[in-house]
């Protein structure tokens, strides 16, 4: 025998107390699949959360975070305060990255600068609180005679003949 509740579409619940008729989900609740015996209460995006997608009779609301905060967790279950680039969030609020570390985002932790020498390279551009170091060629590549590339000839100014 087929379960009579299987005929109830999404957006309804199968009412056991009324000979298993399909009743619509009340406002601010939903059922995303057919054959359900209950409706789920819609998520409410309050406080630091804001509504990204309204709840409907067949799907839950979706939240994101108000400006100055970003989502964490599955389905944006939490909002965490943004910091500036060059900072990280601690229990005491946003703190500047320590020397030798950087953060190029408004979230996350400060990470150590890349150690160029581990790859046998030199530092081309120094790191800052906001940016990682830029590694250049290895010191050996910079020694005289090491390069097989012919350097370009110096440009001559127009109107001057060679001395």
């Amino acid at each position: 025998l087929q379960d009579p509740c299987s005929n109830c579409p999404a957006g309804t619940f199968c009412d056991n107390n009324r000979n298993q008729i399909c009743s619509p989900c009340p406002p601010n609740s939903f059922s995303s699949a057919g054959g359900q015996r209950t409706c789920d209460i819609c998520r409410q995006c309050k406080g630091v959360f804001r509504t990204r997608k309204e709840c409907s009779s067949t799907s839950n609301a979706e939240c994101d975070c108000t400006p100055g905060f970003h989502c964490l967790g599955a389905g944006c279950s939490m909002c965490e305060q943004d910091c500036k680039q060059g900072q990280e969030l601690t229990k005491k609020g946003c703190k500047d990255c320590c020397f030798g570390t950087f953060n190029d985002q408004k979230r996350g932790i400060c990470r150590p600068w890349t150690n160029c020498s581990l790859d046998g390279k030199s530092v081309l551009v120094n790191g800052t609180k906001e940016r990682d170091v830029v590694c250049g060629p290895s010191p050996a590549d910079l020694s005289p005679g090491a390069s097989s590339v012919t350097p370009p000839a110096p440009a001559r100014e127009p109107g001057h003949s060679p001395q």
Epitope: F13, D15, N16, N17, C25, P26, P27, N28, S29, R37, T38, C39, D40, I41, R43, Q44
Partner: nanobody, 120 residues
Amino acid sequence: EVQLLESGGGLVQPGGSLRLSCAASGRTFDNYAVGWFRQAPGKERQYVGTYWSGYAHYGDFENNRFTISRDNSKNTVYLQMNSLRAEDTAVYYCAISLKYPMATVTPDYQGQGTLVTVSS
């Protein structure tokens, strides 16, 4: 931690009325369906009804004698019981859930209950 506190139970004569209250502390009812269950001595727990977003759903025994309402400003839910009978004697429990109705679900939180005795 959410705590639900029922009140308003007591002794009432058959045919009389009683209004039970359920107050929440630690969290508002805002995002929960609120329901009532009851358990008579030596019997299984029975579903009374659920309230959510202006809609109420009731168990199949009460024949329009029971009404659930909600006062958001007081963070309180009520169960109005009229034309009471001896068989309505039970401990009445308030419960909250993210499901509507609660007829077939285990609530997320439930109170300690209040005793209603219908007797002459």
